[in-house]
Structures are given as structure tokens and as C-alpha cells.
């Protein structure tokens, strides 16, 4: 049962991480000046990806920001204290 729970948790976070890497891909496109304006669609991620943050992720949505923080917390739990310290130092910048 524990393995199933871990599987569900990992799957959920894999989806979130997929979203974030898609966001990073968009970010690199923006940095290279590729394509037109972002956002405007009616899909699941139709938020404008316009504001830059210390961790290099674009977001204008508070719920997306919370998802990013959840990913950080999850990675800290999985990867341990050293990762958490790195995350903390980055957040303080």
C-alpha cells in the first residue's frame, strides 16, 4: 500500500515537474526571442508567463507559485538536507 501511495505521489509530482520543464522551455524560447507573444490560450496553462523570479521560473499565477514551492519541498524530502540548504540559499538571493 505504501508503494502505491509513493507511486501516486511520484506521478503527481512528475506531472508538476513536466509542467515546470515546459515552462523552462518557453523561458528559453523567450530568451532567444523565438515566436510571438505567450499566453492568451484557453487551455489549462493559459496564464501569462511574464514575470521573472530569483529561481528563474516565470509565473504570474499564485497557484503556480505554490506548485513550484511544493516541488521544491518534495525534492528536498527526496534528496535530503543538502538540497534544502541549496534551495534556501537560492531563495534568499
Amino acid at each position: 500500500r505504501r508503494d502505491v501511495a509513493h507511486g501516486i505521489l511520484n506521478e503527481a509530482y512528475r506531472k508538476v515537474l513536466d509542467q515546470l520543464s515546459a515552462g523552462k522551455h518557453l523561458q528559453s524560447l523567450v530568451a532567444r526571442g523565438v515566436g510571438g507573444s505567450l499566453g492568451g490560450g484557453a487551455g489549462d496553462d493559459a496564464e501569462p508567463l511574464s514575470k521573472r523570479h530569483s529561481d528563474g521560473i516565470f509565473t504570474d499565477s499564485y497557484s503556480r507559485y505554490r506548485k513550484q514551492m511544493a516541488v521544491k519541498k518534495y525534492l528536498a524530502a527526496v534528496l535530503g538536507k543538502r538540497y534544502k540548504q541549496r534551495v534556501k540559499n537560492k531563495g534568499r538571493r
Epitope: D60, Y62, R64, K88, K90, G91
Partner: antibody
Framework: EVQLVQSGAEVKKPGESVKVSCKAS????????MHWVRQAPGQGLEWMGL????????RYAQKFQGRVTITADESTSTAYMELSSLRSEDTAVYYC??????????WGQGTLVTVSS | DIVMTQSPDSLAVSLGERATINCKSS???????????LNWLQQKPGQPPKRLIY???TRESGVPDRFSGSGSGTDFTLTISSLQAEDVAVYYC?????????FGGGTKVEIK
């Protein structure tokens, strides 16, 4: 019982800085988002920024960018809001508020900061 | 920033009568996660604000059922179905969907 207890009233001169504290209890501090909101006398509410204590990530309102610093001390479950280069328009009650679900479920009692020469 | 426009600025209602406060946002508050982060606060003189309604229509536990929230997208309403003396306060809507988080200007509710 969830509680947010803020530091006492402050009187400051223009150009100075103020640091307000907010001590949290009754919940897991690192699992929350701590926000700061201010209210000038007889005016409405204004969001200043937030901190996620677990990672120390912050997000500030554009209006206060460069002038506000929000920090958190996990060991004491205390959040701090420092506002610099104070001017008379910064006279207000400053509130901390906790968010679990995309909304401010609990608020501190408020800290009056008076800026006067 | 999202502009939150509340109306009216003040409202005088007889005890037992209905009070209706409107809140309009300059952009849809429906988030990608399917929730609408529109909230209603009540603030009495000398006190911090208190959460009444979150997610547009979910009542905070312990809040009397005479308070209800409705609406979607950009148009929202707080209704007090039967005004009581203890409901005299300023009511604020605010949005938690988009940064920067923003508040309406408030509606002062008084007894006629």
C-alpha cells in the same frame, strides 16, 4: 489553535526603516505562506508580499519592490517584514496573514507604524 | 495588476433585510487549477480582517449561513440574507489568483 502574534507599535522618522515581527503557533510554519498586508488610516487593504518559510522564497508587490524585505526564522516560527526609506504615506497598520488554501485564513492583530518627523 | 472594483461604497440596510455587495475584477479569476480565488473579508473597527468566504462561494467554518458568496469569472456578489446588528462592518473582496494580489476598495455596511 492557530495564532499570529505581532510586535508592538512603532514610531519612526522619514528615511528610517522599520522591522515588524509575526510569531506563529498552532500550525506547521514551514508548510504555510506568510503574507504581509497594510492598511493606512481609514483606507483599504494593500498586499505587500509573501514568504514561503520552507525555502525562504519571497514574492513582493511591484509597488514595494526594493523597499521591502520579508524574512522568516524557522527556529522560532517568526516572520519579519522590514520596510526601508519610510515616508509619511507609510503610516499604516501592518498585518501578517497566513495562507493554506489560496486565501488568508488567519490574520495577526496588526502593528501600527507611524512615520512622523 | 488586477483591479478589483467594489460597489456600492456604502450601504444602509434595515435589520432583517437583504444586503448585496458587488465585486468586479478586471480579468477572469478562474485559475488553471479550476478554482476561483475570490475571497470576502469582514472588518470591524479596530480589528483585523476576518475571512468570510473563499473560492468565491465557500463559507468559512463558523460563519453564519446568512452570508453567501456567488459569481464566476469577473463578477462576484456577497449577500447577507438577513442583516443583523453584528454585521455592521466594512466588507472587502480580494483576489488571490494573480500576482500582485489585490483588494477591492471596501463596502461599509450600516443599519438604516
Amino acid at each position: 489553535e492557530v495564532q499570529l502574534v505581532q510586535s508592538g507599535a512603532e514610531v519612526k522618522k522619514p528615511g528610517e526603516s522599520v522591522k515588524v515581527s509575526c510569531k506563529a503557533s498552532g500550525f506547521t510554519f514551514t508548510d504555510s505562506y506568510m503574507h504581509w498586508v497594510r492598511q493606512a488610516p481609514g483606507q483599504g487593504l494593500e498586499w505587500m508580499g509573501l514568504i514561503y518559510p520552507f525555502s525562504a522564497d519571497t514574492r513582493y508587490a511591484q509597488k514595494f519592490q526594493g523597499r521591502v524585505t520579508i524574512t522568516a526564522d524557522e527556529s522560532t516560527s517568526t516572520a519579519y517584514m522590514e520596510l526601508s526609506s519610510l515616508r509619511s504615506e507609510d503610516t499604516a497598520v501592518y498585518y501578517c496573514a497566513i495562507d493554506y488554501d489560496g486565501s488568508f485564513a488567519y490574520w495577526g492583530q496588526g502593528t501600527l507604524v507611524t512615520v512622523s518627523s | 495588476d488586477i483591479v478589483m472594483t467594489q460597489s456600492p461604497d456604502s450601504l444602509a440596510v434595515s435589520l432583517g433585510e437583504r444586503a448585496t455587495i458587488n465585486c468586479k475584477s478586471s480579468q477572469s479569476l478562474l485559475d488553471a487549477d479550476g478554482k476561483t480565488y475570490l475571497n470576502w473579508l469582514q472588518q470591524k473597527p479596530g480589528q483585523p480582517p476576518k475571512r468570510l468566504i473563499y473560492w468565491a462561494s465557500t463559507r468559512e467554518s463558523g460563519v453564519p449561513d446568512r452570508f453567501s458568496g456567488s459569481g464566476s469569472g469577473t463578477d462576484f456578489t456577497l449577500t447577507i440574507s438577513s442583516l443583523q446588528a453584528e454585521d455592521v462592518a466594512v466588507y472587502y473582496c480580494w483576489q488571490g489568483t494573480w500576482f500582485d494580489l489585490t483588494f477591492g476598495g471596501g463596502t461599509k455596511v450600516e443599519i438604516k
